[in-house]
């Protein structure tokens, strides 16, 4: 048994460009709190019971109000450590999830609103009893600095908290076969207390309360010699008295899962699938209500007003699991065709297409202009085995993304000045010329080569070319 301890040092903008905006404002003051979830082993796969080693929620931090115009500083943190007690051995390798939550304290209807600010995850090796390990993790533009350690609760010691210690009976040395307890040199390693009645000759234990048999012995207390003859069934007889091989107790015998959890055997141990409201290795951690914020990733918590009634998390798009702890990898379904790259933006899927394809799922082959590959109202035109964009007025370039300069081609003749206009271009003609592009000379006698200037328009006035 022992405790995993997490100390948050700072949470604020990370280095580099793109500092995040402060999560709180004068209109919407807020405070932070943290949630840690621990799982044994190095598996990134979140089980349905997500925090098999345990989880903890910090206190709420001080209320913070952003100073107008100031960048987000390191935000004020809750006091104290986050502590996750573990009842069994410390696994040595573990996965963690640390979530930073914002509690908005404006005048929301129905109390404060929670939203997830940042989520970091990692996999680490850690021996119990060691020094604090420091870590820095980044989530988007945010940076979280923290330290963690695992320590054993007396009388347990060792890197896995499986050895037991007791005070020395004599000041000089420990009893026969027992070593001093590092780091508690004034104590002695205690012999493990096996299951009551476990045969001292034929049984042994690696964990308190168990009874494992030496070869040739069987039975719950290792008192039955194994005989391979006269067995009545492939698994051995139902009674141990015949001296046949009886399988020892399976890891799920007697259902170690509390609170209605269901047990399934794993290659090395067992796994409990817990009902809502309970978690931990044996579903022993209970009393979680919506007030504890059990729904990850912005899930909406419903019910669970008191510790006896279960809560339900309604997950936002892209998340699932009883605590919304599992991200649905929608890109794993490979929705983007023709070599397109998939982005799961949370609120939507986006496909980045390879050259030659377009469309929401890169389903259109651009050779046949089926895909809309032209921006700003341009239309696709086939030709020469490739597509072209015929651009709307005012736009140009390969895909009509460039704002066209209608004056670039010098369309005004005879020294006329060109002006770009929202509907095209306007030519201001030099004296003696007129027309949309100043292409017509004005006759010396004042008559024009054109029929007549429109009323109110003198020769030399700007002519709009449409």
């Amino acid at each position: 048994a022992g405790v995993f301890e997490l100390q948050i040092h700072s949470f604020g903008p990370g280095p580099g460009p793109g500092a995040p905006r402060s999560p709180c404002s004068a209109r919407l003051p807020c405070r932070l709190f943290f949630r840690v979830c621990l799982k044994p082993g190095l598996s990134e796969e979140a089980a349905e019971s997500p925090c098999a080693l345990g989880a903890a929620l910090s206190a709420r931090g001080p209320v913070y109000t952003e100073q107008p115009g100031a960048p987000a500083p390191d935000l004020p943190l809750p006091d104290g450590l986050l502590q996750v007690p573990f009842r069994d051995a410390w696994p040595g390798t573990f996965s963690f999830i640390i979530e930073t939550w914002r509690e908005e304290l404006g005048d929301q209807i129905g109390g404060p609103a929670w939203s997830l600010l940042a989520r970091v995850a990692g996999r680490r090796r850690l021996a119990a009893g060691g020094p604090w390990a420091r870590d820095i993790q980044r989530a988007g533009a945010w940076e979280l600095r923290f330290s963690y350690r695992a320590r054993c609760e007396p009388p347990a010691v060792g890197t896995a908290c499986t050895r037991l210690c007791r005070p020395r009976s004599a000041p000089s040395r420990c009893g026969p076969g027992l070593r001093p307890c590092a780091p508690l040199e004034d104590e002695c390693e205690a012999p493990l207390v096996c299951r009551a009645g476990c045969s001292p000759e034929h049984g042994f234990c690696e964990q308190p309360g168990e009874c494992r048999c030496l070869e040739g012995w069987t039975g719950p207390l290792c008192t039955v010699p194994v005989s391979t003859s006269s067995c009545l069934s492939p698994r051995g007889p139902s009674s141990a008295t015949t001296g046949c091989l009886v399988p020892g107790p399976g890891p799920c015998d007697g259902n170690p899962c509390a609170n209605g959890g269901s047990c399934s055997e794993t290659p090395r141990s067992f796994e409990c699938t817990c009902p809502r409201g309970f978690y931990g290795l044996r579903c022993e951690v209970s009393g979680v209500t919506c007030a504890d914020g059990p729904c990850f990733n912005g899930g909406l918590c419903v019910g669970g007003a008191d510790p006896d009634s279960a809560y339900i998390c309604h997950c936002p798009p892209g998340f699932q699991g009883s605590n919304c702890e599992k991200r649905v990898d929608r890109c794993s379904l490979q929705p983007c065709r023709n070599g397109g790259l998939c982005l799961d933006l949370g609120h939507a899927l986006r496909c980045r297409c390879r050259a030659g394809f377009a469309g929401p799922r890169c389903e259109h082959d651009l050779d046949d202009c089926a895909g809309r590959a032209c921006a700003n109202g341009g239309t696709c035109v086939e030709g020469g085995g490739a597509h072209r964009c015929s651009c709307a007025l005012g736009f140009g370039g390969r895909d009509c993304r460039e704002r066209a300069d209608p004056c670039a081609a010098r369309p005004c003749a005879h020294g006329g000045r060109c002006y770009a206009h929202f509907s095209g271009l306007v030519c201001a003609c030099a004296p003696g010329y007129m027309g949309a592009r100043c292409e017509f000379p004005v006759h010396p006698d004042g008559a024009s080569a054109l029929p007549a200037a429109p009323p109110g328009l003198r020769p030399g006035d700007p002519q709009r070319y449409l």
Epitope: A355, R398, R401
Partner: antibody, heavy 120, light 111 residues
Framework: QVQLVQSGAEVKKPGASVKVSCKAS????????IHWVRQAPGQCLEWMGW????????EYASKFQGRVTITADTSANTAYMELSSLRSEDTAVYYC?????????????WGQGTLVTVSS | DVQMTQSPSSLSASVGDRVTITCKSS???????????LNWLQQKPGQAPKLLLY???KLESGVPSRFSGSGSGTDYTLTISSLQPEDFATYYC????????FGCGTKLEIK
């Protein structure tokens, strides 16, 4: 008009890091991949990596893995390429390039290039 | 990694000549989507490269039709049908089927 404008030339000592910027105009970098390519004197062009500014995804050429970091500041419409542990053979012109809003793997628009000189 | 081998490394020609540059890849550039991601770029001294052709033979917008591309599998060709003074430059092939690899260039000089 689509344009990529890069930061000015840099002179660095071996072992140092350099960070080159690439400011985009005429389009939003969230709509496109920004690629980085370098050209050492008299050498081939080398692709270094790309960033998808929409979600920060990056991919790097194996040769530069661990030494190059490509980032983007979407609010400034600017991408950055940082190369660490510089050595003399990193002396090169570094280009940023982008594709089009409908295709991520074409090098249609290029920056003017940034000369990085590594010398003791 | 895919290797791209260009030949010749340099070439002298005159205005009006027909010029061919070849590029060979170490593995097929045919993508599972049926397209072949082979591009050609032109670079003039002191300038950034410029895209000429993509998907083997598709002309980039604004590129003169005297430039053409062909090939499949591992062998590709850039052809300039009638050299113009502004075509003297270095030409690179670039494959984007398997990440991104450039050829080492062919310098086209005036004879």
């Amino acid at each position: 008009q689509v344009q990529l404008v890069q930061s000015g030339a840099e002179v660095k000592k071996p072992g140092a890091s350099v960070k080159v910027s690439c400011k985009a105009s005429g389009f939003n970098i969230k709509d496109d991949y920004i690629h980085w390519v370098r050209q050492a004197p008299g050498q081939c062009l080398e692709w270094m990596g790309w960033i998808d500014s929409e979600n920060g995804d990056t991919e790097y050429a194996s040769k530069f893995q661990g030494r190059v970091t490509i980032t983007a500041d979407t609010s400034a419409n600017t991408a950055y390429m940082e190369l660490s542990s510089l050595r003399s053979e990193d002396t090169a012109v570094y280009y940023c390039a982008t594709s089009t809003y409908w295709s991520y793997d074409l090098f249609v628009y290029w920056g003017q290039g940034t000369l990085v000189t590594v010398s003791s | 990694d895919v290797q791209m081998t260009q030949s010749p490394s340099s070439l002298s020609a005159s205005v009006g000549d027909r010029v061919t540059i070849t590029c060979k890849s170490s593995q097929s550039l045919l993508h599972s989507n049926g397209k072949t991601y082979l591009n050609w770029l032109q670079q003039k001294p002191g300038q950034a490269p410029k895209l000429l052709l993509y998907l083997v033979s598709k002309l980039e917008s604004g590129v003169p039709s005297r430039f053409s591309g062909s090939g499949s599998g591992t062998d590709y060709t850039l052809t300039i049908s009638s050299l113009q003074p502004e075509d003297f430059a270095t030409y690179y092939c670039l494959q984007t089927t398997h990440l991104y690899t450039f050829g080492c260039g062919t310098k086209l000089e005036i004879k």
